[in-house]
């Protein structure tokens, strides 16, 4: 049967009695080793004979003594089989054993839950030596128990190759209840069940949960660890913990928030990073995610010009990283802009809406209907053409810029030309005679300068001779500009 | 199956004594509290209060200390309301019902009609 | 203790119309329970933790609200469907029951 001990019980001896060859308690040790840091096997004194090796837990040494006595079987005396104490307390055991002097390089260890202990662990062995036998006492304490220290615990002893093994000495450190899982934080969709889950472990068993909620204990009666809580569904945020009891009290776990899930808040500081003639760089900071991360955001365009049909272009993107580039916009012109973001509920309201502009570009069109005929009387060149079309001028208009290319045997000049933005004619010098001039126009703007219109070419002849009739840019859709003489 | 089954119907004299008995089977009996809900002729439900099978404690609710007490036989899964001193408003129905989670009333004994009348 | 008023005290109504139950509590709990009772019987558990269907209860019954303010309905009522109701609450003691609402056959 397994003695058991109890923290509260009084210290036991030692060792139970006196040992063999009339060795009081009161002796003093021959030789005493303590071992503050680290356990080293006893040394034994020299035997005058070795033993025959015998297997199992009992040596039965079958060398006799001078007057042929027969020895008797060695093995660990019985100590307490079961220690109980609490957390923090100090405990104090040990293994003995009488050896006969004949041994000799004998070792004690020991062993926890199948493990040699070797490190920092407080062990002594003291030795009480008599005429035929030497008493061994191994003791073995811890000053501050933790649950780590739980397990079974042996001396073993080596004797000329033999192993003897005491019984064990089973050390049970009881406290609270410690905690395996505890309920972890959520964010949970509205009305919607969720579980939590809470366990904890002795000893002493059994360990009994309770759950809280918002103060309020959930279930009435306790329930075995581990527990399941089966949230039937929040409206509102809540807060739960569990308490967890057993025969030394109580601990409580963490309190955990339970968020529920909700549309997030709109975007706020919408702002404006770059402005193109016909793109606008906007960046946000995104509001609330209303504990639910963001999916995707909208950004939401209108003319600002009163006279716009109001419609709303809209740009879908992803929620990260909070930029955005609107694109295919009308240059010079005024915009509302707004931002929602969504997560899985649904979409945020729109941030407050912003005022942005497109900057001046170049013309996206060239100048309509260029004509071009020879004024040989003055040996000038005149052009005509339509301005572009005031919503594809994308800004105001500073001028126009005139390539004119002369061909004649081989060369090739081209020369620009810069005018006003009033007329909508130009005069240029003829250049070169027998050659043909190319004559292409761009309009420009403070953006820069437009495309260049289709080349229309004109013969300038030798002098003497008539005038010609106008070269000008075709329909649209027809072919290359021909000249007409 | 989960039931509750209650003792049958009681007529007592004012002063007397009633114990009714609530039988309960089909769960472990001590996993689950049992409450207490009268229910006087032509009225509403009133909660009583309840007693912890896990350890016995009883939680009466106001106007109903002193008179009413809660107690238990787990051997044969039972728990019983006894009212001493009885009057005429004790006249009324008597429900045990198992206590879930939540403080929920998930099954329901089938009640006992106490009557006090001289 | 948390004091729970039904409204109406009575609902009279024909078969297959929609029933709206109230019960309103003195202050905020986190759940509501609904149970039906029969002239002669036990009372039936019928919505348990505000919105979630009792064990064998079918599905016209339904269950909301949130803090003061819970509602028991029923969609379309079915000739069995006549009866008292009464909500309780959880978050507090006392485990009060509200004084009931009685569905009757108009």
């Known amino acids: 049967a397994i003695t058991e001990a109890r923290e509260e019980a009084k210290p036991y001896p030692l060792f139970p009695g006196p040992f063999p060859g009339s060795l009081q308690t009161d002796h003093t040790p021959l030789l005493s080793l303590p071992h503050a840091s680290g356990y080293q096997p006893a040394l034994m004194f020299s035997p005058t004979q070795p033993g025959r090796p015998h297997t199992g837990n009992v040596a039965i040494p079958q060398v006799t003594s001078v007057e042929s006595k027969p020895l008797p079987p060695l093995a660990f005396k019985h100590t307490v089989g079961h220690i109980i104490l609490s957390e923090h307390k100090g405990v104090k055991f040990n293994c003995s054993i009488s050896v006969p002097n004949i041994y000799q390089d004998t070792t004690i260890s020991w062993w926890k839950d199948g493990k040699e202990l070797l490190g920092a662990h407080h062990a002594i062995t003291q030795f009480y030596p008599d005429d035929e036998v030497t008493a061994i006492i191994a003791s073995f304490s811890i000053t501050s128990v933790q649950r780590s220290d739980n397990g079974s615990y042996i001396c073993k002893m080596k004797i000329n190759n033999e192993e003897i093994v005491s019984d064990p000495i089973y050390i049970e450190v009881q406290g609270l209840p410690h905690f395996t899982k505890q309920p972890e934080s959520m964010n949970v969709t509205r009305n919607t069940a969720f579980n939590l889950t809470c366990q904890a472990v002795g000893p002493p068993e059994p360990v009994n949960i309770f759950w809280v909620q918002n103060s309020s204990r959930v279930n009435e009666q306790p329930e075995k660890s581990p527990s399941v809580l089966t949230v039937p569904g929040l409206t509102e945020m809540a807060v739960f913990s569990c308490e967890a009891h057993n025969d030394k009290g109580l601990t409580v776990s963490k309190g955990v928030q339970i968020n529920i899930k909700a549309i997030p808040s709109p975007p706020t500081e919408v702002s404006i990073r770059n402005s193109t003639a016909h793109s606008i760089l906007i960046s946000w900071v995104p509001g609330f995610d209303g504990y639910s991360p963001f999916r995707n955001c909208s950004i939401q365009v209108k003319e600002a010009d009163p006279l716009s049909n109001g419609s709303v272009m809209i740009f879908n993107t992803s929620a990260l990283p909070h930029l955005y580039q609107i694109k295919q916009l009308q240059a010079l012109a005024n915009y509302s802009i707004g931002v929602s973001c969504m997560n899985e509920i649904g979409w945020s309201a729109v941030s407050p809406w912003i005022l942005a502009s497109t900057t001046e570009g170049a013309p996206s069109v060239a100048p309509l209907n260029v004509t071009v005929f020879l004024n040989e009387s003055s040996d000038n060149v005149d052009i005509r053409w339509m301005k572009p079309p005031t919503k594809q001028q994308d800004g105001e208009l500073v001028g126009y810029r005139i390539s004119h290319v002369w061909q004649s045997a081989g060369i090739s000049k081209e020369l620009l030309e810069e005018v006003g933005q009033n007329g909508s004619r130009a005069r240029i010098s003829v250049q070169v005679h027998n050659a043909t001039c190319t004559v292409r126009i761009a309009a420009v703007t403070r953006g820069g300068v437009g495309p260049f219109s289709d080349p229309v070419k004109i013969f300038i002849p030798a002098h003497g001779w008539v005038d010609y009739a106008p070269s000008s840019t075709p329909a649209p859709g027809n072919a290359d500009p021909v000249l007409i003489i | 199956q989960v039931q509750l089954v209650q003792s049958g119907s009681e007529l007592k004299k004012p002063g007397a004594s009633v114990k009714v008995s609530c039988k309960a089977s089909g769960y472990t009996f001590t996993n689950y509290g049992v409450h207490w809900v009268r229910q006087a002729p032509g009225q509403g439900l009133e909660w009583m209060g309840w007693?912890?099978?896990?350890?016995?404690?009883?939680t009466y609710a106001q106007g109903f200390t002193g008179r009413f007490v809660f107690s238990l036989d787990t051997s044969v899964s039972t728990a019983y309301l006894q009212i001493s001193s009885l009057k005429a408003e004790d006249t009324a129905v008597y429900y045990c019902a198992r206590g879930y989670r939540y403080a929920y009333m998930d099954y329901w004994g089938q009640g006992t009609l106490v009557t006090v009348s001289s | 203790e948390i004091v729970l008023t039904q409204s109406p005290a009575t609902l009279s109504l024909s078969p297959g119309e929609r029933a709206t139950l109230s019960c309103r509590a003195s202050s905020s709990t986190s759940y509501m329970h609904w149970y039906q009772q029969k002239p002669g019987q036990a009372p039936r558990p019928l919505i348990y933790?505000?919105?979630n269907l009792a064990s064998g209860i079918p599905a016209r019954f339904s269950g909301s609200g949130s803090g003061t303010s819970y509602t028991l309905t029923i969609s379309s009522l079915e000739p069995e469907d006549f009866a008292v109701y009464y909500c309780?609450?959880?978050?507090?003691?006392?485990?009060?029951f509200g004084g009931g609402t009685k569905v009757e056959i108009k």
């Open positions: 007693i912890n099978t896990y350890t016995g404690e009883p």
């Open positions: 933790a505000t919105s």
């Open positions: 309780q609450q959880w978050s507090s003691n006392p485990r009060t």
